[in-house]
Interface confidence: low
Amino acid sequence: EEELQVIQPDKSVSVAAGESAILHCTVTSLIPVGPIQWFRGAGPARELIYNQKEGHFPRVTTVSESTKRENMDFSISISNITPADAGTYYCVKFRKGSPDTEFKSGAGTELSVRAKPSAPVVSGPAARATPQHTVSFTCESHGFSPRDITLKWFKNGNELSDFQTNVDPVGESVSYSIHSTAKVVLTREDVHSQVICEVAHVTLQGDPLRGTANLSETIRVPPTLEVTQQPVRAENQVNVTCQVRKFYPQRLQLTWLENGNVSRTETASTVTENKDGTYNWMSWLLVNVSAHRDDVKLTCQVEHDGQPAVSKSHDLKVSA
């Protein structure tokens, strides 16, 4: 009589996280009598996954009806696979006894779990920076397996090269994390720009995951000021305008000073937007010349986004 063989036909099985894994096992004989058990790992520390005879294994179902007469298929399906389920699974035939004794083991099936990386999260600097400055962006993605992963950085579709990437942990693990820091030089045209972190992994079937950061949340473009005197609107009245150009974000407060004394303060409201995303704004001041004996120094002082004020002055000649 030929001795019972335990056949595990698959040396390895690769499953995506969340899927069910089917682990195949057939025996060539019904003798000896005794249950099939499935273990993860070998040796004294092996973990019981399924016991045909007893126990409650909510994630495990048998592919065939194991209680059916003459059943020799003891393949199991393990539901909702996670990276923690990775390992080598052994189908083991036990011989009836008290206790049951191990009779023969299959060669084992190595289960590897393909876990998708989490959506990359891109974060920028805590404080805004001005053009020509270099800022750092970080990108993080977690929970992927296997370890091999590719991360790229882009700014407006152009690949960046100045970045450093680490995959942790260095040794074997059920899942891994990636952390990358990229350096980006800001330009005045970056209000509409995006920084994109792209992660490619075997689980993504050629469709990389992307995380984005809008440079509008990072950049501060300081305004340029121009103060001009308009033609006299009425006798003894001069209109002076302060053009505030190319600033971002919109948060801006303007103060007019006459000979160093505050005349009026206003907040930018009805701004116009430039194609590059920056804003322009204009404020004007009507100066009653007859109220002044001497020349008047008019100053347009602008506080932008909480930064130290910048100003531009204009000397208004008062004829004797």
Epitope: S79, Q205, D207, T212
Partner: antibody
Framework: RQLVESGGGLVQPGGSLRLSCAAS????????ISWVRQAPGKGLEWVGT?????ITYYASWAKGRFTGSKTSSTAYLQMTSLRSEDTAVYYC????????????WGQGTLVTVSS | DIVMTQSPSSLSASVGDRVTITCQAS????????LAWYQQKPGQAPKLLIY???TLATGVPSRFSGSGSGTDFTLTISSLQPEDFATYYC???????????FGQGTKVEIK
């Protein structure tokens, strides 16, 4: 809360058309928008989903010919190289499937591809 | 791609009847529960009834229920109402993002 499609109409085979789907009462920023079509007298057919950011995906038959995009208030479906079998009512719906089901639907816009 | 097979394709029933529609996926749906049911009336857009196989959508009467896991799913209407005469579609999603397929539909008509 509603979605309103527009842009449908008669187009010749090989032509192009861009459908719009305007949202009111909610922002599309944090939602996927899916396009579903229904040929006259036929069942529903998933076309594709425009996710958050730059992520989009399409039914295998739609890849290459159909391209989706969206802003916070409007989603678009650009259709090229149209064929007579693309004749259908096109619906947009909020959602990306699974735990984000298609819960709000537009009224549909009819696209007729004929010479 | 995942294939969703609905049965029956049509049925005739009376008000008050219990109606069951099944939907079978060619492979396990994503997470074993990526299955939604939609109702469509003539000239109207579809309406979400059930998602995640068994979760009732907001505002949907409790006479609608969904069950099933993996590849086999069921929509049950416990007591058919006049407004329930419509076509019902299941929508299943595979493990790939770009793998969402509707069943062919089940038309529920007045007997």
């Amino acid at each position: 809360r509603q979605l309103v499609e527009s842009g449908g109409g008669l187009v010749q085979p090989g032509g192009s058309l861009r459908l719009s789907c305007a949202a009111s009462g909610f922002s599309l920023s944090s939602h996927g928008i899916s396009w579903v079509r229904q040929a006259p007298g036929k069942g529903l057919e998933w076309v594709g989903t425009i996710g958050t950011g730059v992520i989009t995906y399409y039914a295998s038959w739609a890849k290459g010919r159909f391209t989706g995009s969206k802003t916070s208030s409007t989603a678009y479906l650009q259709m090229t190289s149209l064929r007579s079998e693309d004749t259908a009512v096109y619906y947009c719906a909020r959602g990306s499937a699974w735990n984000d089901p298609f819960d709000y639907w537009g009224q549909g816009t009819l696209v007729t591809v004929s010479s | 791609d995942i294939v969703m097979t609905q049965s029956p394709s049509s049925l005739s029933a009376s008000v008050g009847d219990r109606v069951t529609i099944t939907c079978q996926a060619s492979q396990s749906v994503y997470g074993n529960n990526d299955l939604a049911w939609y109702q469509q009336k003539p000239g109207q857009a579809p309406k979400l009834l059930i998602y995640l196989a068994s979760t009732l959508a907001t505002g949907v009467p409790s006479r609608f229920s969904g069950s099933g896991s993996g590849t086999d799913f069921t929509l049950t209407i416990s007591s058919l109402q006049p407004e329930d005469f419509a076509t019902y579609y299941c929508l299943g999603g595979g493990d790939d993002e770009a793998d969402n397929t509707f069943g062919q539909g089940t038309k529920v008509e007045i007997k």
